[in-house]
Interface confidence: low
């Protein structure tokens, strides 16, 4: 999906109002210095592309992020403010919607959410620079 035509201000508002709180709650008990940010993005559409990938595409060591509340809110936000965005374009649709019972949060998942927080912060900073 091409995120170029999204309403970035609305997405930022939704992130600051709710998604960020859920990401921080998920990370509670860990220090921001526990993980190094290895994923970055260069502009707003690129940031959303990376955010979608990290949020919805299961990885071998962290397969369950898509059912978390922050992921559900991210999905709703993208669908609302990105014209033509379709849930069927998310590779992890099945994993996301089935909401299998949550397993204990693994260190690898915490690392992935830490990366997500970094991408969202980058998205906000990029937004500020563009205005």
């Amino acid at each position: 999906y091409d995120f170029t035509n999204c309403d970035f201000q609305k997405i930022e508002a939704d992130y600051l109002r709710t998604i960020s709180k859920d990401l921080i709650t998920y990370m509670s008990g860990t220090k921001s210095t526990d993980f190094n940010n290895t994923v970055s993005c260069s502009n707003r559409p690129h940031c959303l592309t990376e955010i979608q990938s990290l949020t919805f595409n299961p990885t071998p060591r962290c397969a369950s992020l898509a059912k978390e509340m922050f992921a559900r809110k991210t999905k709703a936000t993208l669908a609302l403010w990105c014209p033509g965005y379709s849930e069927t374009q998310i590779n992890a649709t099945q994993a996301m919607k089935k909401r299998r019972k949550r397993k204990v949060t693994t260190n690898k998942c915490l690392e992935q959410v830490s990366q997500l927080l970094g991408l969202w912060r980058r998205f906000i900073r990029t937004l500020l620079k563009k205005q």
């Epitope: 559900r72 999905k75 033509g84 919607k97």
Partner: antibody
Framework: QMQLVESGGGVVQPGRSLRLSCAAS????????MHWVRQAPGKGLEWVAV????????HYADSVKGRFTITRDNSKNTLNLQMNSLRAEDTAVYYC???????????????WGQGTMVTVSS | SYVLTQPPSVSVAPGQTARITCGGN??????VHWYQQKPGQAPVLVVY???DRPSWIPERFSGSNSGNTATLTISRGEAGDEADYYC???????????FGGGTKLTVL
């Protein structure tokens, strides 16, 4: 307990207007997406409209677009449906329904009101 | 727009298993929700997200979803299960909530 109570139904002539209300209690209304769903006599359920938890987004079924307006007053825990240019085919029981999570669209409807009957007839 | 197709009626003998289907193009990629509606009453959510059950719904109610068909299964059918059942999805391409036409379940 969690409850939704609709009001404002009645008999109205074609072309006229009617305003439905839905009073919510027992839950934090401002954090939930809300919908209107209707059911014509002897027919199935038809989704009508949705409003985002903070009122920033609304969306309508094609059959009512441009005629109906969904609003909410979070300070009063109230959902409204302003129905203008009513037609005979709008005759139905109108239910308000809550989405159980922050996302007003993606979730199922876990709480429904008892419904209010709207009859459009000359 | 997206269309959900349900059989108008399904019958089941007491104690037996009833299966109500909901057909839609690639419905397996969507989250399907099911409602029970008894005459003169508001609908009640019985299954959400394909197979999850609200806490107030008995385990006899279950759901599945893959390919082009979602299914609501009611095991050990009882007279109290007689009702209309509706499936529902959100169609992301149109941002519309879509209901199936409903299925009348009769417990013989």
């Amino acid at each position: 307990q969690m409850q939704l109570v609709e009001s404002g139904g009645g008999v109205v002539q074609p072309g006229r207007s009617l305003r439905l209300s839905c009073a919510a209690s027992g839950f934090t209304f401002r954090t939930y997406g809300m919908h209107w769903v209707r059911q014509a006599p002897g027919k199935g359920l038809e989704w009508v409209a949705v409003i985002w938890y903070d009122g920033s987004y609304t969306h309508y079924a094609d059959s009512v677009k441009g005629r109906f307006t969904i609003t909410r007053d979070n300070s009063k825990n109230t959902l409204n449906l302003q129905m203008n240019s009513l037609r005979a085919e709008d005759t139905a029981v109108y239910y308000c329904a809550r989405s159980p999570q922050w996302e007003s669209i993606f979730e199922a409807f876990d709480i429904w009101g008892q419904g209010t009957m709207v009859t459009v007839s000359s | 727009s997206y269309v959900l197709t349900q059989p108008p009626s399904v019958s089941v003998a007491p104690g037996q298993t009833a299966r109500i289907t909901c057909g839609g193009n690639n419905i397996g990629s969507k989250s399907v929700h099911w409602y029970q509606q008894k005459p003169g009453q508001a609908p009640v959510l019985v299954v959400y997200d394909d197979s999850d059950r609200p806490s107030w719904i008995p385990e006899r109610f279950s759901g599945s979803n893959s390919g082009n068909t979602a299914t609501l299964t009611i095991s050990r059918g009882e007279a109290g299960d007689e009702a209309d059942y509706y499936c529902q999805v959100w169609d992301s391409s149109s941002s519309l909530v879509v209901f199936g036409g409903g299925t009348k379940l009769t417990v013989l």
